[in-house]
């Protein structure tokens, strides 16, 4: 029985050229997190595996940084980074939990007035 819930940073905006932290948090379960995937709909960005550590998709290595924690930091943002990001928590014994974040990358002057969310 999957009792857990995923909390995410929800819809976030950031400015072009800046950076953003994508973060999810699994709560209400004692299940052990064995792997977390960060993905877009058509490709994987990063994997944090309990045994193997972090793997970053090669094309993103120079502007994606692991962490903080199980989160992911995107740097040198471009308008093309706008879109959906998924965190997939592989857990034992519960199974898989998925969270969704929508990132909008804006021109600097617009982004300054946009809402930003971050899970403490």
């Amino acid at each position: 029985m999957m009792t857990g819930t995923i909390e995410t940073t929800g819809n976030i905006s950031a400015e072009k050229g800046g950076s953003i932290i994508l973060q999810c948090h699994l709560s209400s379960t004692t299940a052990q997190v064995t792997q977390v995937n960060w993905e877009q709909q058509d490709q994987l960005l990063a994997i944090c595996n309990a045994d193997l550590g972090w793997h970053i998709y090669p094309a993103f290595k120079d502007r994606v940084a692991p962490g903080p924690g199980l989160g992911l930091t995107l740097q040198s943002l471009t308008v093309n980074d706008t879109g959906e990001y998924f965190c997939i928590y592989h857990t034992y014994p519960d199974g898989t939990y998925t969270g969704r974040i929508f990132l909008e990358v804006l021109e600097s002057s617009v982004a300054e007035h946009g809402a930003r969310f971050q899970i403490p």
Epitope: Q35, N37, Q41, Q43, L44, I47, N49, Y57
Partner: antibody, heavy 118, light 107 residues
Framework: QVQLQESGPGLVKPSETLSLTCAVS?????????WNWIRQPPGKGLEWIGY???????SYNPSLRSRVTISRDTSKNQFFLKLSSVTAADTAVYYC???????????WGQGTLVTVSS | DIQMTQSPSSLSASVGDRVTITCKAS??????VAWYQQKPGKAPKLLIY???YRYTGVPSRFSGSGSGTDFTFTISSLQPEDIATYYC?????????FGQGTKVEIK
Amino acid sequence: QVQLQESGPGLVKPSETLSLTCAVSGYSITSDYAWNWIRQPPGKGLEWIGYISYSGSTSYNPSLRSRVTISRDTSKNQFFLKLSSVTAADTAVYYCARRQVGLGFAYWGQGTLVTVSS
Amino acid sequence: DIQMTQSPSSLSASVGDRVTITCKASQDVSTAVAWYQQKPGKAPKLLIYSASYRYTGVPSRFSGSGSGTDFTFTISSLQPEDIATYYCQQHYSTPWTFGQGTKVEIK
């Protein structure tokens, strides 16, 4: 329970356009996931054709991109495959499938055989 | 495109035997590999995702392992109902690609 069901002509003439429908029941195609087409020539392996996501964005296999269009009718909870300029090499069982990020293709239709022949 | 090469292409084993299939990716795909079972005339069924995680309802005799470019799928004790063709698939990036399949038969 999610169910996917392919339908369409079983025979298509060379150079014509293959058109298939995938009817989804038990889940709204606008709620989540990527809705895919995958094919399997007789006695051969599986080839991913492309998808339309719940938000309407599409992604195609580069090997077929110039001939493929995937679209949807949200009111009927259906999505469609069109493959133009078909040849005998396009003869295959065509499957629709639901993909979940991080997992793979967890739900499949039963498949429909399309033969390209004059 | 990422090529997935499976071996062997077919095998014959006795009921109760341990069966192992390997899959090699043409580049590092971390743990983004799934395994499917396809019986004749039927659609494939997802068995394993992310290299080693059993999908809901899949019997414990099916397991997967590996990371990077080398992956293994194992049936710990072959049952008559396991006669099928098994495919690996990378879910690392599009175009998503499959191995050519391994046909498992009973001796």
